[in-house]
Every structure is written in C-alpha cells, then in structure tokens.
C-alpha cells in the first residue's frame, strides 16, 4: 500500500499544475471501496503496480486515491438533446505519476506511469447512479465501466441504462 503522506504532498503539488491544459475543478483524496465494502488496494510487484479488490483486516489502513475532477463540455450534436451539456470527468491516481488507465483491448484496468498531458484512457466520466455510490465510465469507450471481476478491477460493458445500478460497477468514496 502507498504511504498517505506521499499522496498528500502530491496533492499539494498537483494544485500548482494542470492536466491536458485545464486545471481540475476540485481534487479529493479518498479510499475506494466496492458496493459490498471490499477495498481497492495497490501493490508494487516486480516493478509494476497491481490492483486488488480485497477484504481488509480490522485495523488495516485503506489505500488512498487522488481523484481529480474535470468539467467537460458535451456539444449538443453529440448529446442528442439539442443543448450543450456538462459532465464531470475524473482521473484516479494512487501515487505520484501513476494513473488508472482503461485498456479497452484487454478489458482491463491498469496503473500506468505517464506524463502530462494525460491520455484519454486515464479519464472516466463520473456517474452517481445509486445513493452515495459512483461509477466510472471510460471516456474512450462509452458504455464501458470500471467494475469488479474475480477480485480484480476490469472493464465491464453495460448494455442499457437499466443495468447502470448493477453492483459490480458501483463504488464508494470515503475520506476514512
């Protein structure tokens, strides 16, 4: 697990920078857990980071993720509503210079070290589709969400809006 103090220093540093030419509208340091209260954890193994979904022991510290929120204009010709809309996009970074990425070919979620500007694969459209839970939809692949599969994070295709409340794509954010 990553040390929280490093993430807090990183949070301060990020406030002075910008990503993809725009600054986040806000940032939030939080632990990420599933709808069923399993923790999302990050571990360094063989010089690469692995992401796990697991039950933590009683006093075990939860890993924190820096969520950076961006406002994105959605033109009316894409929205189909005849009006321009805004949506929230997030990037998720558990440690300095590493961000969660959507690997659409492998249907996997990976931690990549990257330079700014961040690639589109690092951005997720934020949904709150269920009381106090959020979901993360791939910017690069609409209808595909970060989800839980076999105790790992994976990309899961959601076929219709009725399935957006399916538990395996719902996550909780907590400051504790």
């Amino acid at each position: 697990a990553f040390g929280i103090s490093g993430v807090q220093k990183y949070t301060r540093a990020l406030h002075d920078s910008s990503i993809t030419g725009i600054s986040p509208i806000t940032e939030y340091l939080a632990s990420l857990s599933t709808y069923n209260d399993q923790s999302i954890t990050f571990a360094l193994e063989d010089e690469s980071y692995e992401i796990y979904v697991e039950d933590l022991k009683k006093d075990e510290k939860k890993d924190k993720v820096l969520l950076s929120y961006y406002e994105s204009q959605h033109p009316s010709n894409e929205s189909g509503d005849g009006v321009d809309g805004k949506m929230l996009m997030v990037t998720l970074s558990p440690t300095k210079d590493f961000w969660l990425h959507a690997n659409n070919k492998e249907h996997s979620v990976e931690l990549h070290k990257c330079e700014k500007p961040l690639p589109d694969q690092a951005f997720f459209v934020l949904h709150n589709m269920h009381s106090n839970c959020v979901s993360f939809e791939c910017k690069t692949d609409p209808g595909v969400f970060i989800g839980v599969k076999d105790n790992h994070l994976a990309l899961i295709k959601v076929d219709s809006s009725e399935n957006l409340c399916t538990e395996n794509i719902l996550f909780k954010l907590s400051e504790t």
Epitope: S79, D81, K86, M87
Partner: antibody, heavy 121, light 107 residues
C-alpha cells in the same frame, strides 16, 4: 431549450395522496437526474428526492415512507406521490434538473416555476 | 444526514457593501456545495456550484470559497438586484440538504 413544468391539483385533503407530474423537454431523462424540492410558505427549501438518470431513486429520509418518485420516459414525465398528507405538506413544489450529465454534484440550473399545493379539508 | 448551517439568518446592507454569508456542513462534503439566490415568488437561481464555480450568466461580483466543511458566498459590491434570500446546498451525498437561508435586506 430546457423546460420543466409541474402540474397537479392545487388542493388536497388531509390523509389523501398528493400527486404531481413534472413534464420535461429539451433533454433526456436517460442523461439527467430530476429532483423534487418543496418550500412551505415563508420558509426555506427542502429536498424531497431524486430520480437519477440510471433509474434509481433517492429520498429525504424523513419522508421516505410516504414518498414515491417514478418516471414515464415515453411521455418525458417524472411523477411524485406523497401519501397521508397533512397541513405541514402545504408548499410550493418544484421539479429541477441536474446541472451535470449523470451526476448531481453540480447542483441545479434548471427549475420549474413551481406549483402551490395546499392541504386542507 | 448532513446538516447545513447558514449564518447569519439575515443581514442588512447598503448598495456597494461587501456581503459575506457562511455555510457549515456537519461533515466533510469535499467541494460539492452550491449557492442559490431566490427572490419572492420566483424559483431559486443557481449562482455557484462545486463551491467556487460561477454558474453561466452570474455576475462576477459573486464568488464562492471553501472546501470540506466551511464555505463562504461573497458579494463584493452589493447591487439593488441582489436583495434576496440565499441558500447553500450540499450535493456530496443524498439526501441533498439545504441551509436554512440568509435574507439580504436593504439597510
């Protein structure tokens, strides 16, 4: 352009069910959440509940046992039903739309004009 | 549920004055706070969202600050059309509770 219009009876008898409809235009209920908010005469705003873009609902905990919010997407309508009403439910009822697609974090830009419902025998 | 406490409940001010309204959340809500202005007989109007973001068409004399539990709405130079009631609302978690309102009156 975006519009929300509340409709329903202006007078409801105590113990009966208050039923209101919000008819929306200029946006899709599959992309934006619609909320109900009320304001008793001379008082502040009270959030009642939401029908989210994904179809799930959220309610004010104090009213949860009496409140139901549902939608008819084909008519672009969101309905509110509040059962067992008393004089304390007399208020202007507003329906409002989320600022952001798929998310309530951005507050509410678009409001209906509100409809006054009086509970009295 | 998260409680939102606004202060003061009313303020008397003159045109040109700087007016500050505060909102205190009973638990941390990140930056997910909105401010609304309401005039008698009218629907509320969104002024500020995400604690600091000015809604479209809102004059720049309005500004928002804060994060976590403490938030402020500032009107830098009060104009005649600003006399109204102002509400904060937390949007971090459902139920999305409002503050009790602050009435800005003419001195």
């Amino acid at each position: 352009q975006v519009q929300l219009q509340e409709s329903g009876p202006g007078l409801v008898k105590p113990s009966e069910t208050l039923s209101l409809t919000c008819t929306v235009s200029g946006f899709s209920l599959s992309k934006y959440g619609v909320h109900w908010i009320r304001q008793p005469p001379g008082k502040g705003l009270e959030w009642l509940g939401v029908l989210r873009a994904g179809g799930s609902t959220g309610y004010n905990s104090a009213l949860m046992s009496r409140l139901t919010i549902s939608k008819d997407s084909s008519k672009s309508q969101v309905s509110l039903k509040l059962s067992s009403v008393t004089a304390a439910d007399t208020a202007v009822y507003y329906c409002v739309r989320d600022h952001y697609y798929y998310s309530s974090y951005g507050g509410f830009v678009y409001w209906g004009q509100g409809t006054l419902v009086t509970v009295s025998s | 549920d998260i409680q939102m406490t606004q202060s003061p409940s009313s303020v008397s001010a003159s045109v040109g004055d700087r007016v500050t309204i505060t909102c205190l959340a009973s638990q941390t809500i990140g930056a997910w706070l909105a401010w609304y202005q309401q005039k008698p007989g009218k629907s509320p109007k969104l002024l500020i969202y995400a604690a600091t973001r000015l809604a479209d068409g809102v004059p720049s004399r309005f500004s928002g600050s804060g994060s976590g539990t403490d938030f402020t709405l500032t009107i830098s130079s009060l104009q005649p059309e600003d006399f109204a009631t102002y509400y904060c609302q937390q949007l971090d978690s459902s139920p999305y509770t409002f503050g009790q309102g602050t009435k800005v009156e003419i001195k």
